[in-house]
């Protein structure tokens, strides 16, 4: 139900990345607008992106006050220029969204490698602890600190002149591994958090090769 | 509940090939690594490779690398494993198993097995 | 490759036994080792992971530990349904390698 010139927002969407959070929702208004609720299951709904025309809305803010709860959203749909205008029940028109657990469904962005050093037949490898939004004392959490040992990095490393991919994995953001010694090894990383059934892994990083300008080699 | 099933095991002449099939139900592979592991009869076991769905990323024992490749196909959910250049040392049950972790190697799910029979 | 070395082949126990099988790799594998059981005719299941960690499902009775580059699988109270091939597997580097397997039978 509703007035006849508004229309219930749907395919309400949760996109988000290491935190980063966005609702989408369609259609694209035609002489509507739009303004969205957040609330974890026993709290109060809290309005955000008042009166407005786009068809998404960032809820990043609310989400990383607490990643481990289950949040639900809720989108009103008003008439352009009377917002004050309700449904035929007396309410705005309004559609909920999936609920949504950023801790367990936020997917894990792309990782870059930071570094490597070869020493001899060992490369170190080193993953850049990526920084989110979700905040403590007023500093940035990195995606370590927020999932602590749940995350681990799987490494691929393959000779420049062969196609197999070796593999390693860490709980830290660090791999010693051992390779042939003059050869040219590249690599490619994944986080992946184990015990997810969904959204696992994330992309892989950018392919990083030894004899290029991010890595140091040192022959002991 | 997840699920790993093989098929197209079978007779075949040394030299000869086969595809064996490993659908998978009630997880998606992209999330996660499959494996080949195989048996000979009264054996113990043998990994054979490692696909990871997600980036079509391989690797392959050295006793069947070049004769055997390993794909996926993430529309059907389904890995596959291409037996080239098939030698009597290769008869076994063939299995496909999800990785627990990333691509650590850990085999939290099995299928029930094909068996491979390479014989003239 | 790394070899898993694992001892005895075969063991022969009673129900209620308290069991032990070994797991020697030729180089460090940190706690990179899993245990699984086989049936005669079925697929192995696992049993433990990285190296002490009952899987989910697993009786309490089965334990895994690490020793340096040694490993063992322990069950404590053999039951009837134990009867079975045991291998342990090393996935600290690609590619992962098996025990050659322990077979327990019934005294």
């Known amino acids: 139900s509703g007035t006849t010139n508004t229309v219930a927002a749907y395919n309400l969407t949760w996109k988000s990345t290491n935190f980063k959070t966005i609702l989408e929702w369609e259609p694209k208004p035609v002489n509507q607008v739009y303004t969205v609720q957040i609330s974890t299951k026993s709290g109060d709904w809290k309005s955000k992106c008042f009166y407005t025309t786009d068809t998404e809305c960032d809820l990043t803010d609310e989400i990383v006050k607490d990643v481990k709860q289950t949040y639900l959203a809720r989108v009103f749909s008003y008439p352009a220029g009377n917002v004050e205008s309700t449904g035929s029940a007396g309410e705005p028109l309004y559609e909920n969204s999936p609920e949504f657990t950023p801790y367990l469904e936020t997917n894990l962005g792309q990782p870059t490698i930071q570094s490597f050093e070869q020493v001899g037949t060992k490369v170190n490898v080193t993953v850049e602890d990526e920084r989110t939004l979700v905040r403590r004392n007023n500093t940035f959490l990195s995606l370590r600190d927020v999932f602590g040992k749940d995350l681990i990095y799987t490494l691929y490393y393959w000779k420049s002149s062969s196609s197999g991919k070796k593999t390693a994995k860490t709980n830290t953001n660090e791999f010693l591994i051992d390779v042939d010694k003059g050869e040219n090894y590249c690599f490619s990383v994944q986080a992946v958090i184990p015990s997810r059934t969904v959204n696992r892994k994330s992309t892989d990083s950018p392919v990083e090769c030894m004899g290029q300008e991010k890595g140091e080699f040192r022959e002991i | 509940e997840v699920q790993l099933v093989e098929s197209g095991g079978g007779l075949v002449q040394p030299g000869g090939s086969l595809r064996l099939s490993c659908a998978a139900s009630g997880f998606t592979i992209s999330d996660y690594v499959i494996h080949w592991v195989r048996q000979a009869p009264g054996k113990g076991l043998e990994w054979v490779g490692y696909i990871d769905p997600s980036n079509g990323f391989t690797y392959y024992a050295d006793s069947v690398k070049g004769r055997f490749t390993i794909s996926a196909d993430t529309s059907k959910n389904t890995a596959y494993l291409q037996t080239n250049s098939l030698r009597a040392e290769d008869t076994a049950v063939y299995y496909c198993?999800?990785?627990?972790?990333?691509?650590?190697?850990?085999?939290?799910?099995w299928g029930q097995g094909t068996l491979v029979t390479v014989s003239s | 490759d790394i070899q898993m070395t694992q001892s005895p082949s075969s063991l022969s126990a009673s129900v209620g036994d308290r069991v032990t099988i070994t797991c020697r790799a030729s180089q460090d594998v940190n706690t990179a080792v899993a245990w699984y059981q086989q049936k005669p005719g079925k697929a192995p299941k696992l049993l433990i992971y990285?190296?002490?960690f009952l899987y989910s499902g697993v009786p309490s009775r089965f334990s895994g530990s690490r020793s340096g580059t040694d490993f063992t699988l322990t069950i404590s109270s053999l039951q009837p349904e134990d009867f079975a091939t045991y291998y342990c597997q090393q996935h600290y580097t690609t590619p992962p390698t098996f025990g050659q397997g322990t077979k327990v039978e019934i005294k």
């Open positions: 990285s190296a002490s």
């Open positions: 198993a999800r990785d627990i972790q990333s691509v650590s190697g850990e085999f939290d799910y």
